[in-house]
């Protein structure tokens, strides 16, 4: 088949914690990213306060964070715990534009969700969220 | 409705699955008023790292 997957919905939004990072200029100063779940799709990084620039795509790595605390989630020695979270938003309607990070609907919803999570997990330790995916309920 | 799936990252040892879910559920009312998002059917689980190729995107709830 022709075509190549691009424009991943994999985005890391962060709360400004001082994680050391391996990033590229396209990362817009985002301190770290999680590799995309698309094996053939670049990772897209974006600050929660700005619109996603779908052209800023690249691969980057999880930083070597250090911590002596016992892990609360299965992981390697990255110093980071990851949690998968799923929920329904019952007062919104899915449409196909939620499959594309360059659309207004996707960006507005991602921004609201990102800001919401920054509010919820204000305590130190929250590094960010990534791999946002929307699907019909 | 819209189902949202995402991955949260925390510093190692700062939070567990139960607390992630509890804090999120406690915020649902404020989410409705502040962001006009009516949230339900919350599910939280650990993500092994590195992520598997299958990942969470194949889940259907």
């Amino acid at each position: 088949a022709s075509g190549s997957a691009s424009g991943s919905a994999s985005t890391l939004v962060h709360n400004g914690t001082s994680a050391r990072a391996t990033t590229t200029p396209a990362s817009k100063s985002t301190p770290f990213s999680i590799p995309s779940h698309h094996s053939d799709t670049p990772t897209t990084l974006a600050s929660h306060s700005t619109k996603t620039d779908a052209s800023s795509t690249h691969h980057s790595s999880v930083p070597p964070l250090t911590s002596s605390n016992h892990s609360t989630s299965p992981q390697l020695s990255t110093g980071v715990s990851f949690f998968f979270l799923s929920f329904h938003i019952s007062n919104l309607q899915f449409n196909s534009s939620l499959e594309d990070p360059s659309t207004d609907y996707y960006q507005e919803l991602q921004r609201d969700i990102s800001e919401m999570f920054l509010q919820i997990y204000k305590q130190g330790g929250f590094l960010g969220l990534s791999n946002i995916k929307f699907r019909p309920g | 409705s819209v189902v949202v799936q995402l991955t949260l990252a925390f510093r190692e040892g700062t939070i567990n699955v139960h607390d992630v879910e509890t804090q999120f559920n406690q915020y649902k009312t404020e989410a409705a008023s502040r962001y006009n998002l009516t949230i339900s059917d919350v599910s939280v689980s650990d993500v092994p790292f590195p992520f598997s190729a299958q990942s969470h995107h194949h889940h259907h709830h």
Partner: antibody, heavy 117, light 107 residues
């Protein structure tokens, strides 16, 4: 490598129906959308509609409502499009295009439908 | 519906030449525009997504840009396999619509 395999060419009678398929392989995600597009011989492209695989969520171009019906089967990672009450205007190549982090990322090779008495 | 006016409808050019194809949108579509390439056998491949992002595996001689409501696909130095058909596609709002196409022919 992602592949979209569409079903073979169809020669059908006016007034009848035809159902074509679009099978995805080589991709780990089973949740994504499929768009369907029409191209008449020597002409441009027209969007027919969209279905999110494994759900009953669909969107249609008003022009094709009542003409096209989109369905899918998650277990076989296959999307289907049925065209009804066929006329010569429906003679065309029909493409499926799937999402992969963004819309219209991968395209099938097309299914030629010829409506002829 | 959003109209995409694609120009020129056909273009004759020489190997190595730089060419630009244009799509004008009738309404604001932001960056929600793709460029597609169609081979003579019908095969369609996406070249550019979100106005200016190059799909993986697409040669760097292809680039996309925007100026207001005008969207351009530029091929910096034509190669023999580039002489095919090109379409723009907007996905800002349903129904998604395509430009009329540009046939690129060898001079």
């Amino acid at each position: 490598e992602v592949q979209l395999q569409q079903s073979g060419a169809e020669l059908v009678r006016p007034g009848s129906s035809v159902k074509m398929s679009c099978k995805t392989s080589g991709y780990t995600f089973t949740s994504y959308g499929i768009n369907w597009v029409k191209q008449r011989p020597g002409q441009g492209l027209e969007w027919i509609g969209y279905i999110y695989l494994g759900s009953d969520y669909t969107e249609y171009n008003e022009k094709f409502k009542g003409k096209a019906t989109l369905t899918s089967d998650t277990t076989s990672s296959t999307a289907y499009m049925q065209l009804s009450s066929l006329t010569s205007e429906d003679s065309a190549i029909y493409f499926c295009a799937r999402s992969a982090g963004s819309l219209f990322a991968y395209w099938g090779q097309g299914t030629l439908v010829t409506v002829s008495a | 519906d959003i109209q995409l006016t694609q120009s020129p409808s056909s273009l004759s050019a020489s190997l190595g030449e730089r060419v630009s194809l244009t799509c004008r949108a009738s309404q604001d579509i932001g960056i929600t525009l793709n460029w597609l390439q169609q081979e003579p056998d019908g095969t369609i491949k996406r070249l550019i997504y979100a106005t200016s992002s190059l799909d993986s595996g697409v040669p760097k001689r292809f680039s996309g840009s925007r100026s207001g409501s005008d969207y351009s696909l530029t091929i910096s130095s034509l190669e023999s396999e580039d002489f095919v058909d090109y379409y723009c596609l907007q996905y800002a709002s349903s129904p998604y619509t395509f430009g009329g196409g540009t046939k690129l022919e060898i001079k």
